[in-house]
Amino acid sequence: IVLRPSRVHNSEENTMRALTLKDILNGTFSYKTFFPNWISGQEYLHQSADNNIVLYNIETGQSYTILSNRTMKSVNASNYGLSPDRQFVYLESDYSKLWRYSYTATYYIYDLSNGEFVRGNELPRPIQYLCWSPVGSKLAYVYQNNIYLKQRPGDPPFQITFNGRENKIFNGIPDWVYEEEMLATKYALWWSPNGKFLAYAEFNDTDIPVIAYSYYGDEQYPRTINIPYPKAGAKNPVVRIFIIDTTYPAYVGPQEVPVPAMIASSDYYFSWLTWVTDERVCLQWLKRVQNVSVLSICDFREDWQTWDCPKTQEHIEESRTGWAGGFFVSTPVFSYDAISYYKIFSDKDGYKHIHYIKDTVENAIQITSGKWEAINIFRVTQDSLFYSSNEFEEYPGRRNIYRISIGSYPPSKKCVTCHLRKERCQYYTASFSDYAKYYALVCYGPGIPISTLHDGRTDQEIKILEENKELENALKNIQLPKEEIKKLEVDEITLWYKMILPPQFDRSKKYPLLIQVYGGPCSQSVRSVFAVNWISYLASKEGMVIALVDGRGTAFQGDKLLYAVYRKLGVYEVEDQITAVRKFIEMGFIDEKRIAIWGWSYGGYVSSLALASGTGLFKCGIAVAPVSSWEYYASVYTERFMGLPTKDDNLEHYKNSTVMARAEYFRNVDYLLIHGTADDNVHFQNSAQIAKALVNAQVDFQAMWYSDQNHGLSGLSTNHLYTHMTHFLKQCFSLSD
């Protein structure tokens, strides 16, 4: 399936040019998406090109400036948040990034009724997290690891927690491991639907070992960064969940929510909190050995002012073939009766599907089924359930949006997106207004991305929100590579791959091949999305063939493929990349003397192991910020897939699966090892240990470190990185500069 047909006729060929590395580094061909900031069923806010915050009313078709760019600029605001009663806006400035999601900022409150900033009882700075209540204009915020509450922006704050301490106790915000590996948010507090209660997590990191690394900066002495970071098998954070009545916060104070007995009997995690009503809350817990998850529905007891979680409202989800859930355990979407819910989990055939749970998980009613997977439930209304899946035409790397009518029996299913712009759009997400009155569809490709607005009742397209016309025009004279997504059938395993081919690709010629790999559990690289990136350049200008392969351990193709890597990381992922390369060679257009592999993070681990596989297939390869031993990586992530590094559990495979154990095998390949010294995620330690093992084995290799850079290698480091890797590959493939 050629997704980007060549638009070129010979007569036009002279005006066409190849992509340059500069194009990629400058972001010349980046695209825009449009996600409405919904504030009601028919209204949304959006920041205009000139930085005004504009309200759009879909029904009237009219726009209104609610906050001028001058007001934004007066405090150098980079973000904003409207209070639900529309009386105030918070303006966020002095953004300072911490980890993947977390950052601190300064917040100003602007009064929309008088057009002035709120003076008196101003917020402290910097704030770690701030949010409005879902109704009215109460404020909850986290400052110095403690939670504060304001009934109105101008009021003095009420301090909810007092034990917060840097790197020790975190209230309302996650510690490092919960942020990165469990919650995937910067916050750990949740308002009840009408703002009556505020739930929050407390993380106690007192006993967690600390990772320490130097931050060189500009001073005479480097700083030491200390992060409580539990590596595999180490002591984990202790989590507790509390709920406070925000109307009378001083009355009984925060009340702890009990942990289900079957969870509390050994080490455990809190995985998510979902409010159902103002007086009903749903908590999800997970055993440290992550194959048992418990969903617990708790009710407020007015007489005792406590939260009660009856055993009859505990729902257990267990995996016998792997870990619970996909990457995370899915969260429930409650229906209007406030007790039954919809949830995605594996069916009896091992495919993740939507189930409706009314009383017990055992009696769950399966809503979707087939040899494909339901991926996300977007919205449940009185009569419809909107979800995404990769069902259409059996391409796992696609995403379409479906509507199931739950108001009628039997429920009927309709694909909302499958035939909208079939060639251009095969990978969608959606954003819904209140009660799904309207929704935005964001199409990511394979063609140029486009965002559209739709009527939630009829699915009719109302207008185009963003169609990337400038990008389309800019690409008219660019020789883009061709892309195809196909599959290989090998030993009862389906290996989907994406191949990126040079613009004038000729099957009778031989091309150098670069494998780009990630390959982590529950990931997917072969997706029908648009991208003009470094590998596009390598195909367009340098004439390389690039391939991405989804092997065992990857997602959305059923549990057999997903859980194949359980307790055995570093084996099948590598095998499947090698198998695919052999198949590509058989296709006849690959120069088997010029094959390389590269990857970042988990991909750096896989590329390193592939290079050290001893197959002789790879001439060279690059590992950026690789994991080198699972003993060095975070407990929550690592143990999910590997169990514990103990003798009576899985220590043997922890030891066997290191990159260092294969140091000798790097002798016959050209290896480029790259890492940021301030990587809080995959610590520089990983590459330091690879380098040490290679030196000890007297194996020559190339390396590059990026001082004070984290796992993302951003800013000027990005330019240096891709320039450096380009030179390395061109040299490896004997391509002239």
């Epitope: 028919q42 029904e59 209104y64």
Partner: antibody, heavy 119, light 111 residues
Framework: EVLLQQSGPELVKPGASVKIACKAS????????MDWVRQSHGKSLEWIGD????????IYNQKFKGKATLTIDKSSSTAYMDLRSLTSEDTAVYYC????????????WGQGTSVTVSS | DIVLTQSPVSLAVSLGQRATISCRAS??????????INWFQQKPGQPPKLLIY???NRGSGVPARFSGSGSGTDFSLNIHPMEEDDTAMYFC?????????FGGGTNLEIK
């Protein structure tokens, strides 16, 4: 101080047209929409329409479509309303009002322009 | 169009007492938790002045003796304590749906 200064009274013949001006001061014209309202003698108020100054986008009361046309001149911070094909029914006081979109409220009003249609 | 019916048409209240004006909409003007009902005061020869917006929020410089309440289709304006300066016409107005419409007005005077 927010001020909406409207043009003076008009006496016109049936079938004629009239253009009422509304000069905004004390705030930036493009920060708020401008709405127009009419009040016939001894009667209640009727909403005519709304204009978004940044793009000139308008919405009208169906009743006034073809009767009223709203425009903006950003350079002079002035909003205009054209009324055409006037009849005695159009005799009224016409107000321009600053419209605070986030609250859907007309928070400041001009002093009004009296239009009398008589032969 | 949404029709707003005000009652009473006229009202006389003693100084210091409470004045209550009602406004009933022909259909709900609730919008996802908010009600876009506004109240205006108009004195002879003057333009209307915004008193209350969004059902219950006082406009700029409006004294605390003016308050608004209601939801769905039934809304009211309360003035307490009544002062001499409050003699005027009062209009309710909805901006939940185009065309925005006004009530017929209530004439408030001192008893």
């Amino acid at each position: 101080e927010v001020l909406l200064q409207q043009s003076g009274p008009e006496l016109v013949k049936p079938g004629a047209s009239v253009k009422i001006a509304c000069k905004a001061s004390g705030y930036t014209l493009t920060d708020y929409n401008m709405d127009w309202v009419r009040q016939s003698h001894g009667k209640s108020l009727e909403w005519i329409g709304d204009i978004y100054p940044n793009t000139g986008g308008t919405i009208y009361n169906q009743k006034f479509k073809g009767k009223a046309t709203l425009t903006i001149d950003k350079s002079s911070s002035t909003a205009y309303m054209d009324l055409r094909s006037l009849t005695s029914e159009d005799t009224a006081v016409y107000y321009c009002t600053r419209f605070r979109g986030i609250h859907y409220a007309m928070d400041y009003w001009g002093q009004g322009t009296s239009v009398t249609v008589s032969s | 169009d949404i029709v707003l019916t005000q009652s009473p048409v006229s009202l006389a209240v003693s100084l210091g007492q409470r004045a209550t004006i009602s406004c009933r909409a022909s259909e709900s003007v609730d919008n996802y938790g908010l009600s876009f009902i506004n109240w205006f005061q108009q004195k002879p020869g003057q333009p209307p002045k915004l008193l209350i917006y969004g059902t219950s929020n006082r406009g700029s410089g409006v004294p605390a003796r003016f308050s608004g309440s209601g939801s769905g289709t039934d809304f009211s304006l309360n003035i307490h304590p009544m002062e001499e300066d409050d003699t005027a016409m009062y209009f309710c107005q909805q901006s939940n749906e185009v065309p925005y419409t006004f009530g017929g007005g209530t004439n408030l005077e001192i008893k």
